[in-house]
Interface confidence: medium
């Protein structure tokens, strides 16, 4: 009889029990598996997925995906992205790959995750005086107000403002009057001038001279080029001949000599090393740029799979040959490993020494040298004006400095001349002509140098020599010799510039040329009626007198007891008395000299606050206030 | 004739791998060198690496390094490629293609084989 | 990104004649890489049309032409045809990839 095996409930996890014979099968419900289904599918536990990735499992719970975060990728999200693949950072910034993201390292001016943000280089504002601030790229660019100038309007635009000087010439101020330096090429008081710069001798060859600012340019006739047009055209200053290509100049052509690698007419193309089948014996040919190299298969070795993987002495009997003659031309073969190969003599190549190695090929001699081949070696024959192992070098006849009075020396095969700059001529430029005659320019009918100044000549041009108290190319400004300082400091009240010459006014108390002697005011003795003198360089007179009782005045020359100092205002009397004279006001007025009211606010109770003194005035609200330290205002408030 | 054919289109699934089968005929297989080259829909053409039948070297491009095998089988006159860890960018017509020197042009190309990635 | 650019479309009317440049660098065609051009029309496989820089297959048109100069080489059509509208591809070589295989990102031909 059969027996149900599933009476027993044998299948967990509400599987169903199929009974069978001599046995039963469980059918599972996911997630569950196994005999009697007591295997739980969980595939996302543990995660496999790395780096916070959420893990998923299929359907079938026999498999899982991971879904990645922001910057990883991969099966198990193991791979770092990398963003910077995708060029994030902006206005040139650097991108560096980290784990998860990626950071921005801004170029100078830029900020942002992806420096995106153009900083704001006017915050705080930079520009001075009242100039207005425009953002820029890590700058900032002020608009100044008028009168000020600069980067950042830190400037005050001085007296030149007017800018009287031409073609980017400095402007020195004078005074009433300025002068001109002129930059190199440019002339005149003004430097409106530009100077000429061609000379009969500037361009060779029949060259046409262009004048420049303190240069010049030559228009050359077919046939010849160089700045002066002293080469006759070589077809290789256009450096024709690429990859480093030897280039022959020819008439009217030229013939590139290419090194090992490249061919074409300008040595353009890599040589297809390939297509002449060097491999022998079945070897692949694997070119790698201007090199190959052949794969050989078993059994062949050597350069070109033309060695057969034996010894040097079965190779020699395999080709009839005693071993010391195998390697042709006295090479050496040497056994290695299970093949051998040859040892050449200087000067042969290939496998079995059998090639005549060329030295001339392709030609290391240059400048229309001939090339010799010998063993191991070759040599260079030059054409005249060129020398080197390769004839590279040309000689330089301008080495001896034959052009005079800054003439230019152009070296050329074999020879050289001299362009000459104005005002020289010969052919080593030794010529200096006299460019201080005539003494008045012929052209403006001025002198060429203003204010008594000397000429004195130079190479293309002149120079003046000022008398004192003038400056300028021509003499022309008037030196302001104030600017100087000359005055001493303390005892100058004012410096006046003169014709070549300054004048100090001095502060009182002070003499000397530049005030700078104290004057002794008490030498003459000026104090009368037994007064006691004390030096005072800070007063007008240079002395103060100390009176004795009962007389007063700057040299104590009044009687205080007499009315003949004391002046009574506002029609008061003077009466005298034993030791000082005193005035007798009218009605409505009071003090010393009846100067103040007698209704001033001081005497009906003190005005002032914080300990403030009152003090009557003449004019109206008739007092003031004298504030102690710490206080100020009308009222000492 | 001189011709490259390929083996047929294929559907993956992300993460597994694809091998194609590209067999020489009509001329020596061990003289030129094989390329596999890739378009996906709507990009241009992508080499991914270069085979010498003659003794299975290879040189493969850097961006599937790692990823990508490629065989030579002289007796059947066929190379293969292998490509693993599909993701959906690997959809694209994949081509064998052959050259005479390991610098040389492409002038005979397979059909292309088809490679769906998808889940 | 293809290291070889070329422009994305170019067209032309029948009988017209157009060009398409390829631009690399000193690392590929300056270096003395040759460059070779392959027409791909859609569903076939790529058909070399003009190899180591200006050369003709046999069987190409002499209505395709083709330079190289520089760092830089271009394909002229001429007499342009209706069966020639298709994708144009320029390849070579590059040293700093170590000789990898460089692609142009291809030209599409429109005849109006």
């Known amino acids: 009889t059969n027996i149900n095996e599933c009476a027993s409930n044998p299948c967990l996890n509400q599987g169903t029990c199929i009974d069978d014979v001599a046995g039963y099968k469980c059918n599972c419900l996911l997630p569950y598996t196994g005999a009697t289904c007591e295997v739980v599918l969980a595939p996302c536990a543990p995660s496999p997925c790395r780096n916070g990735g959420e893990c998923r499992q299929s359907e079938d719970y026999e498999s899982f995906s991971c879904v990645c975060p922001t910057g990883w990728q991969g099966q198990t999200c193991e791979v770092d992205i990398n963003e910077c693949v995708l060029s994030p950072c902006r206005h040139g910034a650097s991108c560096q790959n980290t784990h998860g993201g990626y950071r921005c390292h801004c170029q100078a001016g830029y900020s942002g995750r992806n420096c995106e943000t153009d900083i704001d280089d006017c915050r705080p504002n930079p520009c001075h005086n009242g100039g207005s601030c425009t953002d820029g790229i890590n700058t900032a660019f002020c608009d100044c107000l008028p009168g000020f100038r600069g980067t950042f309007c830190e400037e005050d635009i001085n007296e030149c403002a007017s800018d009287p000087c031409r073609n980017g010439a400095n402007c020195t101020d004078c005074v009433d009057s300025y002068t001109c330096t002129c930059p190199a090429g440019f002339s005149g008081i003004h430097c409106e001038n530009n100077t000429p710069d061609c000379t009969e001798s500037s361009c060779f060859n029949g060259g046409t001279c262009v004048d420049g600012i303190n240069s010049f340019t030559c228009l050359c006739p077919p046939g010849f080029t160089g700045s002066y047009c002293q080469h006759d055209v070589n077809e290789c200053d256009s450096q024709p001949c690429l990859h480093g290509g030897t280039c022959q100049d020819g008439c009217g052509s030229y013939r590139c000599t290419c090194p090992q690698g490249y061919t074409g007419p300008n040595c353009q193309n890599l040589v297809h090393w390939c297509d002449s089948s060097p491999c022998k014996n079945g070897g692949k040919c694997w070119q790698t740029h201007t090199q190959y190299r052949c794969e050989c298969p078993s059994g062949w070795t050597g350069l070109y799979c033309d060695v057969p993987s034996v010894s040097c002495e079965v190779a020699a009997q395999r080709q009839g040959v005693d071993v010391a003659r195998l390697c042709q031309h006295g090479g050496l073969c040497v056994d290695a490993g299970n093949t051998h190969h040859c040892r050449c003599q200087a000067g042969y190549t290939g496998s079995y020494c059998e090639d005549l190695v060329d030295e001339c090929s392709p030609s290391p001699c240059q400048n229309g040298a001939t090339c010799t081949d010998y063993l191991g070696g070759y040599s260079c024959k030059c054409v005249a004006g060129y020398h080197g192992v390769n004839c590279s070098e040309e000689i330089d006849e301008c080495l001896s400095h034959p052009c005079q009075n800054g003439g230019t020396c152009l070296d050329l095969p074999n020879t050289y001349k001299c362009s000459c700059p104005r005002g020289t001529q010969g052919v080593h430029c030794e010529i200096n002509v006299d460019d201080c005659n005539p003494p008045v320019d012929p052209v403006s009918r001025s002198p060429k140098c203003f204010n008594n100044g000397t000429c004195v000549d130079q190479v293309g041009g002149y120079s003046c020599t000022c008398p004192p108290g003038f400056v300028g190319e021509r003499c022309e400004g008037d030196v302001n010799e104030c600017l100087s300082n000359p005055c001493d400091a303390r005892g100058t009240q004012n410096c006046v510039q003169r014709v070549n010459d300054f004048h100090c006014e001095c502060r009182a108390g002070h003499t000397g040329r530049r005030c700078e002697s104290v004057i002794n005011g008490c030498k003459g003795k000026p104090c009368k009626n037994g007064g006691t003198c004390a030096v005072a360089s800070n007063t007008a007179r240079g002395f103060i007198c100390k009176c004795p009782a009962g007389f007063e005045g700057a040299t104590c020359e009044n009687d205080a007891r007499t009315c003949g100092s004391l002046r009574c205002l506002n029609g008061g009397t003077c009466i005298s008395g034993p030791r000082s004279p005193t005035c007798l006001c009218l009605g409505p007025f009071t003090g010393p000299e009846c100067q103040f009211p007698a209704s001033s606010p001081c005497l009906g109770g003190n005005p002032c606050y914080n300990q403030g003194t009152c003090e009557p005035t003449s004019e109206s609200p008739f007092y003031r206030c004298l504030c102690p330290a710490k206080f100020n205002g009308l009222l000492c408030h | 004739q001189v011709q490259l054919v390929q083996s047929g289109a294929d559907v993956k699934k992300p993460g597994a791998s694809v091998k194609i089968s590209c067999k020489a005929s009509g001329y020596t297989f061990t003289k030129y060198y094989m390329h596999w080259v890739r378009q996906a829909p709507g990009q241009g053409l992508e080499w991914m690496g270069i085979?010498?039948?003659?003794?299975?070297?290879?040189s493969y491009a850097q961006k599937f390094q790692g990823r990508v095998t490629m065989t030579s089988d002289t007796s059947a006159s066929t190379v293969s490629m292998e490509l693993s860890s599909l993701r959906s960018e690997d959809t694209a017509v994949y081509y064998c293609?052959?050259?005479?020197?390991?610098?040389?042009?492409?002038?005979?190309w397979g059909r292309g084989t088809m490679v769906t990635v998808s889940s | 990104q293809a290291v070889l650019t070329q422009p994305s479309s170019v067209s032309g009317a029948p009988g017209q004649r157009i060009t398409i440049s390829c631009t690399g660098t000193s690392s590929n065609i300056g270096a003395g890489y040759d460059v070779e051009w392959y027409q791909h029309l859609p569903g076939t496989a790529p058909k070399l049309l003009i190899y180591r820089n200006s050369n003709r297959p046999s069987g190409v048109p002499d209505r395709f032409s083709a330079s190289k100069s520089g760092t830089s080489a271009s394909l002229v059509i001429t007499g342009l045809q209706a069966e020639d509208e298709a994708d144009y591809y320029c390849?070579?070589?590059?040293?700093?990839?170590?000789?990898?295989?460089?692609f142009g990102g291809g030209t599409k031909l429109t005849v109006l």
């Open positions: 293609t052959r050259s005479y020197s390991n610098y040389d042009s492409f002038d005979i």
């Open positions: 085979i010498n039948p003659t003794n299975g070297y290879t």
């Open positions: 390849q070579s070589y590059d040293t700093r990839l170590s000789d990898s295989v460089i």
